[in-house]
């Protein structure tokens, strides 16, 4: 896919940080989402997973940023091969896993 600008990745990281650090109650009421392979194409895979969570304002901005980073249109119920379809995790764990992976990519200078 296209290489997103580092500013968009920074924005995503800061938003994920904001979510993880400011949880006062279970994120999205403890909703479960499909785990994803944190590899190339993960922005679309992350969006495909999170877009199925409705009524959770805490992740609206994350969904919007991911829309901008994913080169194709994503809609609810859509799944790619990037999902680990036998594993569901809480949104809070999903967000933190994604955050730590993005931090690693940023440190290594890989923005794909």
């Amino acid at each position: 896919g296209p290489v997103p600008p580092s500013t968009a990745l920074r924005e995503l990281i800061e938003e994920l940080v904001n979510i993880t650090q400011n949880q006062k109650a279970p994120l999205c009421n403890g909703s479960m989402v499909w785990s994803i392979n944190l590899t190339a194409g993960m922005y679309c895979a992350a969006l495909e997973s999170l877009i199925n969570v409705s009524g959770c304002s805490a992740i609206y901005r994350t969904q919007r940023i991911l829309h901008g980073l994913c080169p194709h249109k994503v809609s609810a119920g859509q799944f790619s091969s990037l999902h680990v379809r036998d594993t569901k995790i809480e949104v809070a764990q999903f967000v933190k896993d994604l955050l730590l992976h993005l931090k690693k990519l940023f440190r290594e200078g890989q923005f794909n």
Epitope: I13, V17, T20, A92, L100, K103, K104
Partner: antibody
Framework: EVQLLESGGGLVQPGGSLRLSCAAS????????MSWVRQAPGKGLEWVSA????????YYADSVKGRFTISRDNSKNTLYLQMNSLRAEDTAVYYC???????????????WGQGTLVTVSS | SYVLTQPPSVSVAPGQTARITCGGN??????VHWYQQKPGQAPVLVVY???DRPSGIPERFSGSNSGNTATLTISRVEAGDEADYYC???????????FGGGTKLTVLG
Amino acid sequence: EVQLLESGGGLVQPGGSLRLSCAASGFTFSSYAMSWVRQAPGKGLEWVSAISGSGGSTYYADSVKGRFTISRDNSKNTLYLQMNSLRAEDTAVYYCAKADFWSGTLWGFDYWGQGTLVTVSS
Amino acid sequence: SYVLTQPPSVSVAPGQTARITCGGNNIGNKIVHWYQQKPGQAPVLVVYDDSDRPSGIPERFSGSNSGNTATLTISRVEAGDEADYYCQVWDSSSDHVVFGGGTKLTVLG
């Protein structure tokens, strides 16, 4: 190779002032947050203050807020800690530490200086 | 303000596994870093981002973090691992860096 070298420590009387410096090399100084961490004799690590890469955001422990000021000169690759109204309980080894990332809330400290001893006593 | 609780001391025989815990309210939501400090020396980062190791740190050092407890695990402990170990997080509610009180690891024998 990343190097952090603190200086400016010494003996000062209660109520006095001291300015610590930390000369940094081996990395793009302005791209990383920096911090001061202290350790009183025989005690654990205590965070003192931190500053963003640009210097635009500063953070202080409650125990030093209003007395200590952190700053940086990115053109000189140097971090500073101005310490005023010093108290006996400020006696400690002061370490300069480099943050491992640009985002403040993800800070871990991947490089530390060897420390400079500040003794506050009459 | 946020509090991190570590056991003051942990003792282990050479070759065994040492586990040092760091307790905090919902610490699993935070990102934990671990430092090793030997007498008279500056701290050294041994685990960052819950479970990653900086280059040069042996694979024997590993970390985990979930719920209310983060754990630093040192397998096949050696005499040279004897040191103080500190956990650390960022507390967003106070904009403070927070360190645990430290754990002294003693290698027996």
